[in-house]
């Protein structure tokens, strides 16, 4: 007996025994009613899920913030939060992330967000800029649609001092109902709902309550979500008595909320730990739960119904759950504007002393080599440029989205992803010398397929089973164009089966398309310069040393032959030893790229967020005048468009960064044809960032 206990102890302490994995999701409840529903949830799930499936345990805490702390401390696993609290959950030391989103509307067209709106009575005759002195109805203090968004947007219009915020809001409106506010310290916030009760006992609490506050004539404006009006007024004639206030100082009918809202707000979201957060288990649990107890599924227990209250555990208006892409952190999920609004509310920034000084541009550098060049640029720029590092291009794009970085230059394939993620192109790399380089954006460069002249039987039509070399997955010349053409031919995405092996940095590590790569250890097949076969030069090197075909740009071969690249692998190469594959099945010499290419590719472009566009544009134009191709001696001076290890930060053949004129969106910049081609290839996309961004903006 003693022996058995000892053995169990060893198992418990060292975790050495093959224990059954813990498949319990500890759900956090914030009230007696929620705890009751949670227990019912637990019991009903037990009755329908096999014993080896996910199960529910219930943990009761006093508040959502206590739940957030409990999850961070591994005392609970999941809770559903309003968007405002998702931000709190994200902040250190909590570090939680969104894992499952509630959706509204139909399964075919699921809405994972709602619109925060300002509703008024049709005959009230005031506009957004006349809200001061009006009476306001809020869903609750600190809630997204009812408080954070409207007050975040109005923040700089509030009377000074703006701290405490409740006092400033109380002085801005002539009276309010803001449930959950401190009625003792801020009686004006409770003027329209004595006591400011923080539950449904207060008739003006929550979405329906705030709307009732307006409907009863207590308030002049209600800050709610777009569906509140429809949920509370079934009759169109009744709805027609109300309008929405738009940010442009106009009004619109309530059904035009897509063109007249304060913000687009992510829906109620389940959060979990970023590390070891059981996100797959939580999804498995909720997915099974919605199958058995979702909308119109069961009489005995309903996930989206609260007989003992309202919105218990989940919103009563929810129709189901969607898995949040694993790539998404809270900042990305909430969106840059929403996060900025909350941050502004908390940090209290306003243009009191208007300034147009551009803050330093934070450039995103990939891996070690780019960071070294960026740091050199930063020193030479005397503080105009700062550097931020990331391991992959997608990590950089994510950092630009959430404000940790501001800009970087991207291949067209990544301009597409960045565009889908809400970034904008601001300047284009230009590769042709001309008198007016900065004003003359080019049509693009050519994507080509290069082979060794000695492999004389190789053509575009018999590439199956050959060894391929790519700049990286998701890049234009190295992936999107050749794989897009290939997809049209083979009608499937199993490119790793089409080629016998290859190097396509960014592929799954166990893929045959990582087999030819040369990076050591963890750097093998990584989409950055730590992988020797990454980028244009890397893909060409891969062809020289191991491959049958390289997908690169038309300048790659001349740039690395005839002694132009002094590296040992390249110094003795001759351009005449290579040929191009043409789409008609013929081959041509390298210099005949204009008549033998796969497609024209858009030039690389600098991308940024909309709000940084002007500063990035201005500072980069200054920087290229100082360090651009006008600098003749790069041995003693910093040169922006030169690299030790090829194409660092910008392509080395960049002559200047050119204005885009009217090609100032990613669609216009890339062109309809290319956008369509990449769109088709999205079926094959392994981009977790693209998945995450199209989750917010389909």
């Amino acid at each position: 007996m003693r022996l058995a206990v000892g053995a169990l102890l060893v198992c418990a302490v060292l975790g050495l025994c093959l224990a059954v994995p813990d498949k319990t999701v500890r759900w956090c409840a914030v009230s007696e009613h929620e705890a009751t529903k949670c227990q019912s949830f637990r019991d009903h799930m037990k009755s329908v899920i096999p014993s080896d499936g996910p199960s529910v345990a219930c943990v009761k805490k006093a508040s959502y913030l206590d739940c957030i702390r409990a999850i961070a401390a591994n005392e609970a696993d999941a809770v559903t939060l309003d968007a405002g609290l998702v931000y709190d959950a994200y902040l250190a030391p909590n570090n939680l992330k969104p894992v499952v989103a509630e959706f509204y509307g139909s399964k075919e067209d699921p809405q994972t967000f709602y619109y925060a709106v300002a509703v008024v009575k049709k005959d009230s005759g005031f506009q957004m800029n006349q809200l001061r002195g009006k009476k306001s109805c809020h869903t609750g203090l600190g809630r997204s649609a009812g408080w954070n968004i409207p007050i975040g947007l109005l923040y700089c219009d509030l009377p000074e001092p703006r701290k405490p915020l409740e006092k400033a809001v109380a002085n801005f409106f002539s009276g309010s109902c803001a449930p959950c506010a401190d009625g003792t310290d801020f009686p004006q916030l409770c003027q329209l709902c004595p006591g400011c009760g923080c539950s449904t006992l207060n008739q003006y609490f929550g979405y329906s309550g705030a709307f009732k506050c307006l409907k009863d004539g207590a308030g002049d404006v209600a800050f709610v979500k777009h569906s509140t009006i429809f949920e509370n007024l079934a009759n169109k004639a009744d709805r027609d008595q109300y309008e929405l206030l738009c940010l442009d100082n106009t009004r619109k009918p309530v059904d035009e909320y897509k063109d007249c809202h304060l913000a687009q707000v992510p829906s109620h979201t389940v959060v979990a730990r970023s590390m070891g957060g059981k996100e797959d288990l939580i999804w498995e649990l909720l997915n099974q739960a919605q199958e058995h107890f979702g909308k119109d599924k069961s009489k005995e227990f309903q996930l989206f119904s609260s007989p003992h209250g309202k919105d218990l555990l989940f919103k009563d208006s929810a129709h189901g759950f969607l898995k949040v892409p694993p790539r998404m952190d809270a900042k990305m999920y909430l969106g840059y504007e929403y996060v900025t609004a909350i941050r502004n509310l908390r940090e209290g920034t306003c243009p009191e002393a208007p300034t147009d000084e551009c803050k330093p541009v934070k450039w995103c550098a990939l891996s070690h080599h780019e960071r070294l060049k960026c740091d050199e640029w930063s020193v030479n720029s005397v503080g105009k440029i700062e550097c931020v590092s990331a391991e992959t291009t997608e990590d950089c794009i994510a950092k630009i989205m959430n404000g940790e970085a501001d800009a970087m230059s991207l291949d067209g394939g990544f301009v597409y992803i960045a565009g889908k993620c809400g970034l904008v192109p601001v300047l284009a790399e230009n590769y042709n010398k001309s008198d007016n380089c900065e004003d003359t954006p080019e049509a693009g460069y050519f994507a080509i397929a290069v082979v060794k002249k000695s492999a004389s039987d190789l053509t575009w039509d018999n590439l199956k089973g050959k060894k391929s070399c790519h700049t990286a997955v998701g890049r234009t010349a190295g992936w999107n164009i050749p794989m897009g053409l290939l997809y049209n031919k083979i009608n499937h995405c199993r490119f790793d089966e089409f080629f016998s092996e290859g190097c396509a940095p960014g592929s799954k590590k166990d893929s045959s398309l990582c087999k030819l790569c040369m990076g050591s250890g963890l750097n093998l097949c990584e989409p950055n310069n730590k992988e020797g076969y990454y980028g244009y030069t890397g893909a060409f090197r891969c062809l020289v040393e191991k491959g049958d075909v390289a997908f690169v740009k038309h300048q790659t071969v001349p740039q690395n032959t005839g002694g132009k690249n002094p590296d040992p692998w390249a110094k003795n190469l001759n351009e005449k030893d290579y040929e191009l594959l043409c789409l008609d099945g013929t081959r041509k010499p390298v210099e005949e790229y204009a008549n033998c290419h796969l497609a024209r590719a858009p030039n690389h472009a600098v991308v940024t967020r909309k709000d940084k566009e002007a500063c990035v544009h201005k500072i980069l134009r200054q920087q290229q005048h100082l360090f651009g191709s006008n600098v003749t001696d790069c041995s003693g001076n910093f040169c922006l468009f030169r690299s030790e290890t090829k194409d660092l930060l910008f392509r080395d053949d960049t002559v200047c960064l050119a204005k885009l004129h009217d090609r100032n969106t990613y669609e216009k910049y890339l062109g309809e044809e290319y956008v369509k081609a990449v769109g088709n290839l999205r079926k094959c996309s392994t981009s977790s960032l693209l998945e995450a961004c199209t989750f917010r903006r389909p």
Epitope: Q127, M128, N129, G152, L153, L154, Y155, C156, D157, L247, D248, N249, N344, C350, P351, P354, D356, V424, K610, D611, K612, E613, A614, H617, K618, K659, N664, T665
Partner: nanobody
């Protein structure tokens, strides 16, 4: 750096006119929403007018019919033509830009991310 510089302010009698200009240097503002705000001494800054890239405009009720906003994208310049001026129009006038693609405009201060230093307009009775 990127700058918005207002000019054209001054003193004028009630009923008179003024034209304010705001020149943007360092960037073409064709995709920004541009606006004028004003702040009277001891008062809160208030929105006056906005103009979208496509030329659509919006005005506060207090200036409707008297003020006209316009922009010349080729010259990177925003204008505010003020007629039938009243003593209550006395204020510091600020030019502001919001980078949102230029397809939508706002009346709220917090949505504008670039501001000029202002030009004073004084209307005496």
């Amino acid at each position: 750096d990127v700058q918005l510089v207002e000019s054209g302010g001054g003193s004028v009698q009630a009923g008179g006119s003024l034209r304010l200009s705001c020149t943007a240097s360092g960037y073409t503002y064709s995709r920004a929403c541009m606006a004028w705000f004003r702040q009277a001494a001891g008062k809160q800054r208030e929105w006056v007018s906005w103009i979208i890239a496509d030329g659509s405009t919006g005005y506060a009720d207090s200036v409707k019919g008297r003020f006209t906003i316009s922009r010349d994208n080729a010259k990177n310049t925003l204008y505010l033509d003020m007629t039938s001026l009243k003593p209550e129009d006395t204020a510091m006038y600020y030019c502001a830009a919001a980078y949102n693609g230029g397809d939508r405009c706002y009346t709220l201060i917090g949505l504008y991310n670039h501001w000029g230093q202002g030009t004073q307009v004084t209307v005496s009775s």
